[in-house]
């Protein structure tokens, strides 16, 4: 035992300080990651801190600037893209955000061989999406909802579609609901592997009801924003998929890909497109009632210049206990024979695992198994399959990368990351070069994030790409909260939780408790990741205990937990938060008179229902941009979990699960309701209806709106929001300011 003189101990204590709200709002303790922009098996590009575009060659250890910051600055470029033939770079500027993924920008093409910008036949502006072909330097782009093709950057464009119309017909880009709830991309066009064909989606929103809201701006009259937005049960977009030969685009024009008969018989969605070869494509379709998905493999018929999708190449995925897939239906990863593929779906025990499909789904060979889940397939090579899972040490909130040797029999499995930096790193993602010759690992925590480069054959670490040294040094004199991840076993349900404890936590004392909740279907809040954020500050400086709980409906712990909320949103998610709070009180260090709950989006819905549960557990709570009724939210998301709001389907639960129906129950809690008026996602309508119900019930509450702000409440609104919520909580918990 080494006794340290108290003098030394005190001086150490004195140099340490708690986190401040300013630290959080300024992003003082944010971290960096390093994702190589791979351009071959052993080369990658990276945008340096001073904005040069640098090529790194792993095998020579050399790097050189291919595009100077001077050239970047000449057009105010913030992003770039090298053509696969390495002759040209597109430079992106005038970024203008639209929705979650979409934005418009101005594009300039720089000719590396001649050291100058391409003049003549310049691109129009603003462009909605632009990309290079996978080989050579053809360009496809979307302008005013139509698709254009250039054989070379200096050539005149060939117009592929002509029917594009704002808010009516979208070609090559998704409409609002497909972008947010189905594709999760800003694009809806896909080049074939060698650039011979270009596939694209056409979305017809002509009959979709429009959400309209005011954008106040600075003018005398506000503008009205109109978005075709199908709410639950409303008319949906009509989707068609076309493919055009880019070598001879005028020859036969775009050819439509047929929809499988069992899908086309009623309302349906297109969910993803995966090219297999230049003449084979795989499309995934989904019934509007989202428990049946069809994967259709189509082949090019040279003689007819059409695409043929034989019934024998249709693979059906159906769920009898919930919806198809997890959050989305998984996508296939094809093997080298160009017909068989690997895919993640539920096994007979109800855990999502990798399966190998050679002929039929019924004959699928299960590749992984166990009471854990395979989460992502990163890469399949001739001899290895790389994937991530939460198998290691049975912590669902971890992610490790595994390699399965598929070239040998029986296949052997190796965890690539499990023992690399075990304390620091338990949550990984990966990025692979061509043929998986090299890969980057990005570790997100629980320690300070670190990005490393590895040999794809031996898994040997080659170098550290980013280790966040500055962050590590900055945190040396900060009293960070303690974090623990544990589980509660309640009525055959496992509730994993993360508890964030004040730095000087003492189990014999009583602390105020704040529950942070999201709780949406197929989400996960309890993850082994690093974060210094608002709740870190609340624990460090304000002495609160914060808890996050993954209840029923959350992901990666099997279908029993995931599908428990099917057709019953707003019930078990809330019950499980309440159950966890009762268990936390039993632990003895929670002041049961000072318990609060807060959440954003789906979390705002859950926190509102928890406050209105009538349990008397919560003193106060906050809902930021909450859903208040499932009839107000998007069809694709809502119906996946709730079915349709019709009498003969699930209208009754749609009505029973609203926040408004529980207005009376808010009488005995302090409620802070917050929403942006320009929220395109969870419309302000949701909070307007809560407020109206509370007023009609003569229930007092607090509210804050953010003018012209969307679902993210970004910029200066963020500072105002967190300052406002901090004051509210400190008042609720009787903490001095």
């Amino acid at each position: 035992i080494v006794l340290r003189p108290s003098r030394v101990h005190n001086s150490e204590e004195n140099t340490m300080r708690a986190l401040t709200l300013k630290d959080i709002l300024n992003g003082t303790f944010s971290y960096k990651t390093f994702f190589p922009n791979w351009i071959s098996g052993q080369e990658y590009l990276h945008q340096s801190a001073d904005n040069n575009i640098v090529l790194y060659n792993i095998e020579t250890g050399q790097s050189y600037t291919i595009l100077s910051n001077r050239t970047m600055k000449s057009v105010n470029a913030s992003n770039y893209g090298l053509s696969p033939d390495r002759q040209f770079v597109y430079l992106e500027s005038d970024y203008s955000k639209l929705w979650r993924y979409s934005y418009t920008a101005t594009y300039y093409i720089y000719d590396l061989s001649n050291g100058e910008f391409v003049r003549g036949n310049e691109l129009p502006r603003p462009i909605q999406y632009l990309c290079w072909s996978p080989v050579g330097s053809k360009l496809a782009y979307v302008y005013q909802n139509n698709i254009y093709l250039k054989q070379r950057p200096g050539d005149p464009p060939f117009q592929i579609t002509f029917n594009g119309r704002e808010n009516k017909i979208f070609n090559g880009i998704p409409d609002w609901v497909y972008e947010e709830e189905m594709l999760a991309t800003k694009y809806a066009l896909w080049w074939s592997p060698n650039g011979k064909f270009l596939a694209y989606a056409e979305f017809n929103d002509t009959d979709i009801p429009v959400i309209a809201y005011s954008y106040y701006g600075d003018e005398q009259y506000p503008r009205t924003i109109n978005i075709p937005y199908p709410k639950a049960g409303a008319k949906n977009p009509v989707v068609r998929i076309f493919i055009i030969d880019t070598t001879y685009p005028a020859y036969v024009g775009p050819q439509e890909v047929p929809v499988p008969a069992m899908i086309a018989s009623s309302d349906y969605y297109f969910s993803w497109l995966t090219w297999v070869t230049d003449e084979r494509v795989c499309l995934q379709w989904l019934k509007r009632v989202q428990n049946v998905s069809v994967l259709s493999i189509c082949d090019f018929r040279e003689d007819w210049q059409t695409w043929d999708c034989p019934k024998t190449q249709e693979h059906i995925e159906e769920s009898r206990t919930g919806w198809a897939g997890g959050f989305f239906v998984s996508t296939p990863v094809f093997s080298y024979d160009a017909i068989s593929y690997y895919k993640i779906f539920s096994d007979k025990d109800g855990y999502k695992h990798i399966h190998y499909i050679k002929d039929t789904v019924e004959n699928a060979i299960q590749i992984t198994s166990g009471k854990w889940e395979a989460i992502n397939i990163f890469r399949v090579t001739q001899d290895s399959l790389f994937y991530s899972s939460n198998e290691f040490e049975e912590y669902p909130g971890r992610r490790n990368i595994y390699r399965i040797s598929i070239g040998s029999y029986p296949p052997s499995k190796k965890c690539v990351t499990c023992h690399l930096r075990k304390e620091r790193c338990q949550y990984y993602t990966a990025s692979f070069s061509d043929y998986a010759k090299y890969y980057a690992l990005v570790c997100y925590g629980p320690g300070i994030p670190i990005s490393t480069l590895h040999d794809g054959r031996t898994d040997q670490e080659i170098k550290i790409l980013e280790e966040n040294k500055e962050l590590e040094n900055a945190l040396k004199n900060i009293q960070l909260p303690k974090e623990e991840i544990k589980k509660l076993e309640v009525d055959e349900i496992t509730l994993w939780y993360k508890m964030i404890l004040p730095p000087q936590f003492d189990r014999s004392k009583k602390y105020p408790l704040l529950i942070q909740v999201y709780g949406g279907p197929c989400s996960q809040s309890v993850r082994s990741v690093f974060a210094v954020n608002w709740i870190s500050y609340l624990a460090s400086k304000e002495g609160m205990v914060i808890a996050l709980v993954d209840g029923r409906g959350t992901a990666f712990q099997g279908d029993k937990l995931l599908y428990a909320v099917y057709r019953k949103l707003g019930v078990y998610e809330v019950e499980d938060q309440i159950t966890a709070v009762r268990k936390f009180i039993e632990m003895g260090f929670i002041d049961e008179k000072r318990i609060a709950i807060w959440g954003w989006s789906y979390g705002g819905y859950v926190s509102s229902l928890a406050l209105a549960s009538g349990t008397g557990l919560f003193k106060c709570g906050i809902a930021v941009a909450p859903v208040s009724s499932w009839e107000y939210y998007a069809s694709v998301y809502t119906e996946r979990f709730m079915g349709l709001p019709t009498k003969d389907d699930n209208l009754e639960h749609y009505k029973n699960s609203t926040v408004m129906a529980r207005a009376e129950y808010f009488r005995n809690v302090d409620y802070l309701l917050i929403h942006g008026t320009a929220d395109d996602n969870v419309h302000f309508q949701n909070s307007a209806q809560i407020a109206k119900a509370l007023v009609n019930a003569q229930v007092d509450f607090q509210a804050m709106w953010y003018s012209d702000q969307n679902h993210g409440l970004s910029g200066l609104s963020t500072n105002h929001l967190y300052t406002h919520m901090t004051h509210f909580l400190k008042q609720c918990f009787s903490l001095s300011d």
């Epitope: 071959s40 052993q42 095998e59 020579t60 050189y64 390495r86």
Partner: nanobody
């Protein structure tokens, strides 16, 4: 700094063949991605063929299977075999890194295809 020196050009009849060579003075790793480019007077320089350190190749559409890029790591050499030459292949041919570095353009080697 590495210097790149092209050779092997000349006058050839349509349908004829040539083998262009590029030798690097100074150490040039076999892992460097290299390429052949060409330029017709009054026109922009363009890529003919590229090869990565891993041996992956890329050819311009106009090549149409007529040319082959290769390298000899022992000799620090990069080569371009030109077969089935056409009058429109007449140009100065250059080797450079792939993508090219502005300071590394050499004198080039002239290929003239004419009957």
């Amino acid at each position: 700094q590495v210097q790149l020196q092209e050779s092997g050009g000349g006058l050839v009849q349509p349908g004829g063949s040539l083998r262009l060579s590029c030798v690097a003075s100074g150490r040039l790793s076999s892992s460097n991605s290299m390429a052949w480019y060409r330029q017709v007077p009054g026109k922009r320089r363009e890529l003919v063929a590229g090869i990565t350190g891993g041996g992956e190749t890329n050819y311009a559409d106009f090549v149409g299977g007529r040319f082959t890029i290769s390298r000899d790591n022992a000799k620090n050499g990069l080569y371009l075999q030109l077969n089935g030459l056409k009058p429109e292949d007449t140009a100065a041919y250059y080797c450079n890194f792939w993508p090219p570095l502005i300071n590394y353009w050499g004198q080039g080697t002239q290929v003239t295809v004419s009957s």
